[in-house]
């Protein structure tokens, strides 16, 4: 069979080969298609078929509007003036070419080192449905590859029978990477050979988390234990720039003291004894809590121990 | 909504002619393939003729070949009927529907408009 | 020219039975084929298109199968509302043809 692709709504002429260019003539058409169930043999003399293909006077058969229900094979059957018999198979595909594909939702910022969404590429109107690919920077995203993945959905209208295809990319931008990358979505069509159609392209910013070191706790004196009446110093050590700021919790509770990296429990009393924290909050990155410290009272001729008690008689201050 | 409005009924002599007119409304009429069809008193139905959306193609049953004419005018939504050589046997109420190809057969019909042949 | 033989040409019955019409082309006509609703002095009404498509507006109880070239309507559970007559139409082949019709009539 000869395959003819037609696009969907366009008119499509197929040749009856070896009919005699004007009647009388001895030909059948007959079609197995969306539209029958097995060989539909067309009446010459037209009838409510005509609609969706007719017999032209020269023996061709027309299609005013192909449909996707016109998919399938068309056979003609010919009888010269001598009585020579010719026949013609035809095999037709149909499609449609959607609209330029866009994307929909876009980032403008990405974070690297965790998954972002970067957006969602909507094709409307193909058929077959083809297909739709990410590209970074102008070369192809692999999915399930180095921090990308792709959610895809197709739906089909119910009544038009074309097709929506969406793809949401997902990506985890490497740390030190382009800080600019350009992403760009392509449907390619199912049929025919055709070239792909391309979005506009998006250059979402990526932000590098400025990385957290360790929010450090020191003691004075060390172990933390001292004998009541003494001093304890908690000095809370954030390197990050800008400094952020500290607040102080004892026993899981924030102190109700103004925000100081540096924590005071002077003349210290069994009321001072439990466990410390501080917490640095940084305006990009939330809070940060440091190791706990177990403050505890040692009486004379006991052993510091490693984690020590202070006793003291009020509050802390802060210096 | 869609609308068909069927006129130009009456009392006509055996030989005579009538011209029968039907208004269209509600939908894109020369999209839609369209057609008569009639029912003689207390009988069934029968299909009169069609044509297609153009206007360039016209069917009939042989009862009517060559006595009826299908027409339409797309730029005024109007279908029509010439019935030329009329008989008693055509008396009957004459509906006008929309469709008659295998996309659509017919969905919708207006109210009729009846047609007595009779001296 | 296809025959579509439909029977029976009437019927009596009680609102809520079940009731089926049958029509037999006489060739092969594929899906093409409607039914209609008639009521005295009005227009045919189109229940089923493309011998088993519901159409728009049409109540469920109404139904329409197709084996072969034998197409069914039937009424799930008649009302009040459906005594009338219903007719079959073939729409693949000139000359259209309709069935004879059947007429629904309360016992």
């Known amino acids: 069979a000869q395959n003819i692709t037609a696009r969907i709504g366009e008119p499509l002429v197929l040749k009856c080969k070896g009919a005699p260019k004007k009647p009388p003539q001895q030909l059948e058409w007959k079609l197995n298609t969306g539209r029958t169930e097995a060989w539909k043999v067309l009446s010459p003399q037209g009838g409510p078929w005509d609609s969706v293909a007719r017999v032209l006077p020269n023996g061709s058969l027309f299609l005013p509007a192909v449909g996707i229900q016109d998919e399938g094979i068309f056979r003609c059957q010919a009888m010269n003036r001598n009585g020579k018999e010719t026949k013609s198979n035809y095999r037709v595909r149909v499609y449609q070419i959607p609209g330029k594909p866009e994307i929909i939702d876009s980032a403008s910022e990405l974070t690297a080192g965790v998954p972002n969404k970067v957006g969602t590429c909507v094709s409307e109107g193909s058929y077959p449905a083809g297909t739709l690919s990410w590209h970074l920077d102008g070369k192809p995203l692999v999915p399930n590859e180095k921090g990308v993945s792709v959610k895809e959905e197709t739906r089909r209208h119910p009544e038009t029978g074309l097709f929506t295809l969406q793809s949401e990319l997902m990506v985890t931008p490497a740390r030190g990477g382009n800080p600019h990358p350009t992403f760009s979505c392509s449907f390619s069509p199912g049929l025919p050979r055709r070239r792909a159609l391309h979005t506009a392209p998006i250059q979402p910013r990526v932000w590098e988390p400025v990385p957290l070191e360790e929010v450090q706790l020191v003691v004075e004196p060390e172990g933390g234990a001292v004998a009541p009446g003494g001093t304890v110093t908690l000095t809370c050590e954030v390197p990050a720039q800008p400094s952020p700021q500290i607040h102080w919790m004892k026993d899981g509770v924030p102190l109700p003291l103004s925000p100081s990296p540096v924590l005071i429990l002077p003349e210290i009393g069994p009321q001072d004894q439990g466990t410390y924290r501080c917490v640095a909050t940084h305006p990009s990155h939330g809070p940060q809590e440091s190791r706990a410290v177990s403050i505890s009272i040692i009486e004379p001729g006991e052993e510091g121990p490693t984690a020590g008690s202070v006793g003291g008689s009020g509050p802390g201050t802060l210096a | 909504e869609v609308q068909l409005v069927e006129s130009g009924g009456g009392l006509v002599q055996p030989g005579g002619s009538l011209r029968l007119s039907c208004a269209a409304s509600g939908f894109t009429f020369n999209n839609y393939w369209m057609t008569w069809v009639r029912q003689a008193p207390g009988k069934g139905l029968e299909w009169v003729a069609s044509?297609?959306?153009?206007?360039?193609?016209?069917y009939y049953p042989d009862s009517v070949k060559d006595r009826f004419t299908i027409s339409r005018d797309n730029a005024k939504n109007s279908l029509y009927l010439q019935m030329n050589s009329l008989r008693a046997e055509d008396t009957a109420v004459y509906y006008c529907?929309?469709?008659?190809?295998?996309?659509?057969?017919?969905?919708?019909w207006g109210q009729g408009t009846l047609v007595t042949v009779s001296s | 020219d296809i025959q579509m033989t439909q029977s029976p040409s009437s019927l009596s019955a009680s609102v809520g039975d079940r009731v089926t019409i049958t029509c037999r082309a006489s060739q092969d006509v594929g899906i093409y084929v409607n039914w209609f609703q008639q009521k005295p002095g009005k227009a045919p009404r189109r229940l089923i298109y493309?011998?088993?498509n519901l159409a728009d507006g049409v109540p469920s109880r109404f139904s329409g199968s197709r084996s072969g070239t034998d197409f069914t309507l039937t009424i799930s559970s008649l009302q009040p509302e459906d005594f009338a007559t219903y007719y079959c139409l073939e729409f693949d082949e000139h000359p259209l043809t309709f069935g004879g019709g059947t007429k629904v009539e309360i016992k």
């Open positions: 529907a929309r469709g008659g190809d295998i996309t659509t057969g017919f969905d919708y």
């Open positions: 493309r011998a088993t």
């Open positions: 044509i297609d959306n153009s206007g360039d193609n016209t």
